[in-house]
C-alpha cells in the first residue's frame, strides 16, 4: 500500500468493526458509527477518522448516527441511538450539508 501522508498529530482510538486490523487504530479523530440497514439490527462500529469531518456534524436519522471525538480512546464507551421512526414526509435526509 502507498505510504499515507502525515496529517499532523494522530489520536489512538478503539477499533471495533469487521475491518479493524487490531483493537486500536490511529487517526485524526475517533469515530463511532451506528448503522441500521433495512431489515437488520443496528450495528455500532468504532474506529478512526481521517477524511470528511463534515460527517461528524450530520444529524442522527432512523438509519445512521455518526459521533466523533478527539482524545485518546474517547470512542471506547460511547453508545449511540438512532432517531425514532418518522413518517415519510418527516424523514430527515442523510446528506451532511
Amino acid at each position: 500500500d502507498p505510504v499515507k501522508p502525515s496529517r499532523g498529530p494522530l489520536v489512538t482510538c478503539t477499533c471495533e468493526s469487521p475491518h479493524c486490523r487490531g483493537p486500536t487504530c490511529q487517526g485524526a479523530w475517533c469515530t463511532v458509527v451506528l448503522v441500521r440497514e433495512e431489515g437488520r439490527h443496528p450495528q455500532e462500529h468504532r474506529g478512526c477518522g481521517n477524511l470528511h469531518r463534515e460527517l461528524c456534524r450530520g444529524r442522527p436519522t432512523e438509519f445512521v448516527n455518526h459521533y466523533c471525538c478527539d482524545s485518546h480512546l474517547c470512542n471506547r464507551n460511547v453508545s449511540l441511538v438512532l432517531e425514532a421512526t418518522q413518517t415519510p414526509s418527516e424523514q430527515p435526509g442523510t446528506d451532511s450539508q
Epitope: H19, C48, L51, H52
Partner: antibody, heavy 118, light 108 residues
Framework: QVQLQESGPGLVKPSQTLSLTCTVS??????????WNWIRQHPGKGLEWIGY???????YYNPSLKSRVTISVDTSKNQFSLKLSSVTAADTAVYYC??????????WGQGTLVTVSS | EIVLTQSPGTLSLSPGERATLSCRAS???????LAWYQQKPGQAPRLLIY???SRATGIPDRFSGSGSGTDFTLTISRLEPEDFAVYYC?????????FGQGTRLEIK
C-alpha cells in the same frame, strides 16, 4: 485488485432521471476507510465532482447539483448508485465512479457516456 | 468552496525537458489532501500524487509534487512520450471536493 465498473443506460430523455450503478469488486464497500464518489466530465471539458456516499449511507453532494442528486449504497451487493433527476442536454457527460481514501481517488471506473437526447 | 486554478492552460514541451505545472487555491488547502491526476484521451483519470508529495503506487519517480497553503506544483523532471496528457489537481478529504480546470501538456 480493486475494480469499479459503472453500468446503466447510455441514453436518457430530457426531463427524465439518469440512473447509474457502480459495482465494486476486489474490496469491501463497507470498509470505514473509504468514501465512494461520482464524478462527471462533459465532452472536452474538465472533471466535476458530483458527490460521495459512505458505507453508513451518509452522503455529501456538490451544492450546484444537490437538488437533483441522490446517491445510495447497497452493501450486500457491494454497489453504490447515482440518480440525477430532471436531466437536460447539459447533463450529457462521461460519468465515473471512484474510491476515495487518504491517498486520494485511488481507483476509478472506466467511465460511461450518458447522452441526454429525445 | 475552494476554487483551484491551474496554470498554464497549455504547456508545449519536448521529450526530455522538465515540466512544471502550477495549482493555486482560493483559500488554504491541507497539504495532506492535495492530489494530482493524469488523464489521456478516452481513459479515466489516473492518480499520480496524493498528500501533495506522495507518489501513488506504480508512479515513476520523475513525477514529484510540492507546495503548501495555496500554492502547489507538479514537476515532471524529464518528459517521456507517454507523459503528454491533461493533468488535474484536486483537493479532497473535506467537502465540497474540487478539481482544477486542467493543464494540457502537449508535444512541442
Amino acid at each position: 485488485q480493486v475494480q469499479l465498473q459503472e453500468s446503466g443506460p447510455g441514453l436518457v430523455k430530457p426531463s427524465q432521471t439518469l440512473s447509474l450503478t457502480c459495482t465494486v469488486s476486489g474490496g469491501s464497500i463497507s470498509s470505514g476507510e473509504y468514501y465512494w464518489n461520482w464524478i462527471r466530465q462533459h465532452p472536452g471539458k474538465g472533471l466535476e465532482w458530483i458527490g460521495y456516499i459512505y458505507y453508513s449511507g451518509s452522503t455529501y453532494y456538490n451544492p450546484s447539483l444537490k437538488s437533483r442528486v441522490t446517491i445510495s449504497v447497497d452493501t450486500s451487493k457491494n454497489q453504490f448508485s447515482l440518480k440525477l433527476s430532471s436531466v437536460t442536454a447539459a447533463d450529457t457527460a462521461v460519468y465515473y465512479c471512484a474510491r476515495e481514501s487518504v491517498a486520494g481517488f485511488d481507483y476509478w471506473g472506466q467511465g460511461t457516456l450518458v447522452t441526454v437526447s429525445s | 468552496e475552494i476554487v483551484l486554478t491551474q496554470s498554464p492552460g497549455t504547456l508545449s514541451l519536448s521529450p526530455g525537458e522538465r515540466a512544471t505545472l502550477s495549482c493555486r487555491a482560493s483559500q488554504s488547502v491541507s497539504s495532506s489532501y492535495l492530489a494530482w491526476y493524469q488523464q489521456k484521451p478516452g481513459q479515466a483519470p489516473r492518480l499520480l500524487i496524493y498528500g501533495t508529495s506522495s507518489r501513488a503506487t506504480g508512479i515513476p519517480d520523475r513525477f514529484s509534487g510540492s507546495g503548501s497553503g495555496t500554492d502547489f506544483t507538479l514537476t515532471i523532471s524529464r518528459l517521456e512520450p507517454e507523459d503528454f496528457a491533461v493533468y488535474y489537481c484536486q483537493q479532497y478529504g473535506s467537502s465540497p471536493i474540487t478539481f482544477g480546470q486542467g493543464t494540457r501538456l502537449e508535444i512541442k
